[in-house]
Amino acid sequence: DTHKSEVAHRFKDLGEEHFKGLVLVAFSQYLQQCPFEEHVKLVNEVTEFAKTCVADESAENCDKSLHTLFGDKLCTVATLRETYGEMADCCAKQEPERNECFLQHKDDNPNLPPLVRPEVDVMCTAFHDNEATFLKKYLYEVARRHPYFYAPELLFFAARYKAAFAECCQAADKAACLLPKLDELRDEGKASSAKQRLKCASLQKFGDRAFKAWAVARLSQKFPKAEFAEVSKLVTDLTKVHTECCHGDLLECADDRADLAKYMCENQDSISSKLKECCDKPLLEKSHCLAEVENDEMPADLPSLAADYVESKDVCKNYAEAKDVFLGMFLYEYARRHPDYSVMLLLRLAKAYEATLEKCCAAADPHECYAKVFDEFQPLVEEPQNLVKQNCELFEQLGEYKFQNALLVRYTKKVPQVSTPTLVEVSRNLGKVGAKCCKLPEAKRMPCAEDYLSVVLNRLCVLHEKTPVSEKVTKCCTESLVNRRPCFSALELDEAYVPKAFNAETFTFHADMCTLSEKEKQVKKQTALVELVKHKPKATKEQLKGVMDNFAAFVEKCCKADDKEACFAEEGPKFVAASQAALA
């Protein structure tokens, strides 16, 4: 449905508060280095303009597209060339090329300082002094660091952030109330950002067919009682929402997400029995709740799939008539029966089935050719089952820190060209799969673990794309979305890698080590471990363990010393020499 003024349409649909929040997020995700005040000024100007269009949709410029309006506004920033370099060239382009240009310049790893959390009293004062500015600052700081954060969901995080301060700044012990809430929001926010980044990568690198296949599998697991047509409708709508958000069309995305939530709540009976409690909530909470809703119970009367997909003589006819619909139904039927499978496994199974049909439907006797197709499925199912079992056993044996170290060594040996900070970040996050998934009942382990690993490996792919250094990483990242994790799992020690020359500076530590938090200490030690493996990629587990144990003992000793710096200066070179000897 067309509107005379798109900006007026969205302002009226979303309301002023959400409109302003979303425009701020959009601008902060595009111009990630701009100061807060500059963004607030731009947002206020856009909002005032939108109000004039609401008053009179025929007013000057009100008929322009949102990309034109927002792009024009971004291109008024005076320091664009100095701050962003070649991104300023985007402003010479016309829409839609200009927006595509801005999208291509989004930086997944912006050079921004880590957010430092002020004292609780300082934060509470700032919150009470100017609540609106305080919340805008939150949106701005998160959005610029996470340029693909799911914008309507970020508004939900901001609402929770506001609620935490409103409650805790009144509490007797403000810190005890507030800090756990902020930690939870930070961790959930990072996870939400990474999950959305995979959705955007799926759409942008592999197209909407890949995203739709993912959505069919996931929604069929969630809503196993829903008909295929219902699941298909939800998939189409969800694809539109995420395509818009990933494309920077945040107002349209938020509006369409609200429409989808409304539709789901009006059609609960044909979707899922689990939606009731979500549908009583206010909009932002409702949409979040629907996205996270637990799987409905599987119908008790589902027949074997063999009849329709193997035994039927019409398999090739049905496939040829509408390939994607037939494969979509296969995926739907498989997924609704298997909430115990990861989405990525289900997609591999559908891919294997598709490959078999492509081959067999061109054969002399198609039925004979595909009669045992499901025998090809068993190893695909057992591979992630075994992987989860082995890694959960290792996690239970080692604990999180040492499990992360095992993964650091494993991945550094696979792809030693990757930068040390990236290997540390990715391996630490891969290691978190243990605490997240291994405690779950068996039925939930594989979907938790493999789909989480897909999100973490996407972060590796996104960072590597910015600065490509390894052909192996490029190959695993670009060849097949669903086979990324098996591709990385299959990588062995890189025999072609020339070990990094030893640099004593890398292994020189100072007294500041002693004042670091436990997490920061771990990162320091893990950074050293990666450098060690890059220097000696063929070092054995025992050798590396010995060096790391000596390292821990050396740091502990010097941190207990009266003159810490002198201890580090004296003991450091001894540690380096002993380590070199141990690894010789």
């Epitope: 599987m298 298997h338 115990d340 499901f374 039925a443």
Partner: nanobody
């Protein structure tokens, strides 16, 4: 061909407990639902309890709160813990495995007799 073997049946006093087990002779890779059924004297076979691979459980109204269905992945075994048994629980208890790509599998049954 995979076999299902039930065990744990027997004679028990009213109010007593039994634990039935159903073991598969080999690992079954395409299970999607497991269930216990029973056939009382002169009755049709009826559903007692099911558990999906997503760990959702469902029970016949007559056994709710008294029976618990569970499975052990590593041992490839399905269980039915039966407490507060009643004479009307008497019958032949069968386990069933529903598969995604093959015909469903049934065990040969184990007899449960509850005396008053």
């Amino acid at each position: 061909e995979v076999q299902l073997v039930e065990s744990g049946g027997g004679l028990v006093q009213e109010g007593g407990s039994l634990r039935l087990a159903c073991a598969a002779s080999e690992r079954i890779w395409d299970i999607n639902l497991l269930g216990w059924y029973r056939q009382g004297p002169g009755n049709e076979r009826e559903l007692v309890a099911t558990i999906t691979v997503g760990d959702s459980t469902s029970y016949a109204d007559s056994v709710k709160g008294r029976f618990t269905i569970s499975r052990d992945y590593d041992k490839n075994t399905l269980y039915l813990q039966m407490n507060s048994l009643r004479p009307e629980d008497t019958g032949l208890y069968y386990c069933k495995i529903r598969r995604t790509w093959h015909s469903e599998l049934w065990g040969q049954g184990t007899q449960v007799t509850v005396s008053s």
